[in-house]
């Protein structure tokens, strides 16, 4: 039976190199000095270790740094970062943007993992603020990260970062976040022509005010119903039937299927029935002909 715990003669690792891939897992444990590993972490990435061998190396680092790894080691973790748990990462103090970039690069192309979320959280807390460089880095790697920020944090997002945002990255944003992001997107895309501008701004329109929707209605944009349904109710209500018809273009027929849902339902209640009838969609619930419409909100403002 093989019962070895000490490093076999001649196997003590002098440096981290390719010869270690031949080592058994127990030999890595017994023959690789943790301090040597820590100083030569940058070499690990170039060596085709198995996942289990990486687990052994992680175990050695854990024993050397029970309170958490120093940043000099963290920056060179490479693929070993994928072996870290959120609990491991919570022990770290990451302050260098270069360290953050190096670790985000390892996870590039994948969804934001709990490890990455924890790393970003630790980084932001370590820095004490969300500066422009940090946000540029985070939105470059994870455009969807925007929706995880509070409206207060979003206020410091530079408009230039908005260019990296894909429509699906805003799926989890709530109206309060879109209220902050929309003006930035408007600014970022302001020099684009009409149709290109609409393609880019469309995902952010959940934060658009009434006047911007009115302006869009004059540009033959043909907004789809999915986008229309995400608009702020208070921004849609003042739109006239003619403006909604121009805004939606051929998609206006979709209003019938959505007449019981917000914001369509609330908008219908504000329109004259004879105006709704001009659409020929059979929309019901508008203000009957001959009724006087009092704008109570205006009356309150005047008093």
């Amino acid at each position: 039976e093989v019962e070895k715990t000490a490093c076999p003669s001649g196997k003590k690792a002098r440096e981290i190199d390719e010869s270690l891939i031949f080592y058994k897992k127990w030999e890595l444990e017994a023959c690789v000095d943790a301090a040597l590993l820590a100083t030569q972490m940058d070499r690990v990435n170039a060596i085709p270790f198995t996942y289990e061998q990486l687990d052994v190396l992680k175990h050695k680092l854990d024993e050397l740094y029970p309170q958490g790894y120093p940043e000099s080691v963290i920056q060179h973790l490479g693929y070993l970062f994928l072996k870290m748990s959120p609990e491991d990462i919570r022990k770290w103090n990451v302050t260098s943007l270069e360290t953050l970039k190096a670790l985000l690069e390892v996870n590039k192309g994948h969804e934001m993992s709990p490890q990455v979320a924890t790393l970003i959280d630790r980084f932001v807390k370590g820095r004490g603020q969300l500066d422009k460089d940090t946000l540029d880095t985070l939105t470059a790697f994870y455009p969807g990260y925007l929706c995880s920020l509070s409206p207060e944090e979003l206020s410091s997002v530079p408009p230039s970062s908005i260019w990296a945002v894909r429509p699906q990255d805003l799926d989890t944003c709530d109206p309060r976040q879109l209220d902050v992001l929309y003006p930035k997107a408007r600014l970022a895309f302001q020099n684009m022509n009409g149709s290109e501008y609409f393609v880019k701004i469309q995902s952010f329109l959940g934060g658009a005010p009434t006047e911007d929707l009115k302006a869009l209605s004059q540009q033959n944009v043909s907004m789809d119903l999915a986008t229309f349904m995400k608009l702020r109710t208070d921004a849609v209500l003042p739109l006239t039937v003619a403006e909604v018809q121009k805004l939606l273009g051929p998609h206006v027929e979709g209003l019938k299927a959505e007449e019981r849902h917000r914001p369509v339902r609330d908008w219908i209640l504000r329109q004259r029935q004879d105006d709704l009838d001009t659409l020929g969609l059979g929309l019901q619930g508008g203000i009957p002909n001959g009724y006087l419409v009092l704008d109570l909100s205006m009356q309150e403002a005047l008093s």
């Epitope: 039976e1 019962e3 070895k4 031949f22 058994k24 996942y51 289990e52 052994v56 175990h59």
Partner: antibody, heavy 121, light 109 residues
Framework: QVQLVESGGGLVQPGGSLRLSCAAS????????MGWVRQAPGKGLEWIGY???????YYASWAKGRFTISRDNSKNTVYLQMNSLRAEDTAVYYC???????????????WGQGTLVTVSS | IQMTQSPSSLSASVGDRVTITCQAS??????LAWYQQKPGKAPKLLIY???DLASGVPSRFSGSGSGTDFTLTISSLQPEDFATYYC????????????FGTGTKVTVL
């Protein structure tokens, strides 16, 4: 004398759960990597997974999510929790010990006698 | 890593030299074990580290190879050797289907 004894097998309905135990005697289980292997009637050996001495677990790709290996060193016992069982999980389940301490590096030198799990309605 | 074992079965006589091969889909260095299993019994480790004889195993069993190609040889088949033999790679246990080979059944000719 070094020995492994599995228990907890039996008849279970599809969709059900079962926890198998493997009690070790004659050695300290905490010093060894311990694995589970199964064998369907008339078929070959099929690896389920193993747990290292530092409690890292490794599973066959088909076992991930449904099967969980754990150990209780104080009871000198290793466990296999099986969930959402299917008819094709019917097999003799063996627990086994690595030759040396730490990780699976060489092979399983000590095997239990096996416990039969039958998944049927 | 996939393990391909051949032949799936073979018939031989007592005293014959028997060779079973195992091929790995990628380099596993010397990280290979061989087992013997008899009906109704648990497997028994024969060879570890591709060529090292496990404790109590007769010297007529030997293993060779490294990298991707491995061989188990029984120099002179004995009556108690009629059984099924399996190889197992122990290089990697992450994201694999089954580290065991499909088995070779040795029967009496």
């Amino acid at each position: 004398q070094v020995q492994l004894v599995e228990s907890g097998g039996g008849l279970v309905q599809p969709g059900g759960s079962l926890r198998l135990s493997c009690a070790a005697s004659g050695f300290s289980l905490s010093s060894y990597a311990m694995g589970w292997v199964r064998q369907a009637p008339g078929k070959g050996l099929e690896w389920i997974g193993y747990i290292s001495t530092i409690a890292n677990t490794y599973y066959a790709s088909w076992a991930k999510g449904r099967f969980t290996i754990s150990r209780d060193n104080s009871k000198n016992t290793v466990y296999l929790q099986m969930n959402s069982l299917r008819a094709e999980d019917t097999a003799v389940y063996y627990c086994a010990r690595e030759i040396r301490s730490g990780w699976v590096d060489y092979g399983f030198s000590i095997w239990g006698q096996g416990t039969l799990v039958t998944v049927s309605s | 890593i996939q393990m391909t074992q051949s032949p799936s079965s073979l018939s031989a006589s007592v005293g014959d030299r028997v060779t079973i091969t195992c091929q790995a889909s990628q380099n596993i260095y010397s990280n290979l074990a061989w087992y013997q299993q008899k009906p109704g019994k648990a497997p028994k480790l024969l060879i570890y580290d591709a060529s090292d004889l496990a404790s109590g195993v007769p010297s007529r069993f030997s293993g060779s190879g490294s990298g991707t190609d491995f061989t188990l040889t029984i120099s002179s088949l004995q009556p108690e050797d009629f059984a099924t033999y399996y190889c197992q790679q122990v290089r990697s246990s992450s994201d694999i289907d089954n580290p065991f080979g499909t088995g070779t059944k040795v029967t009496v000719l």
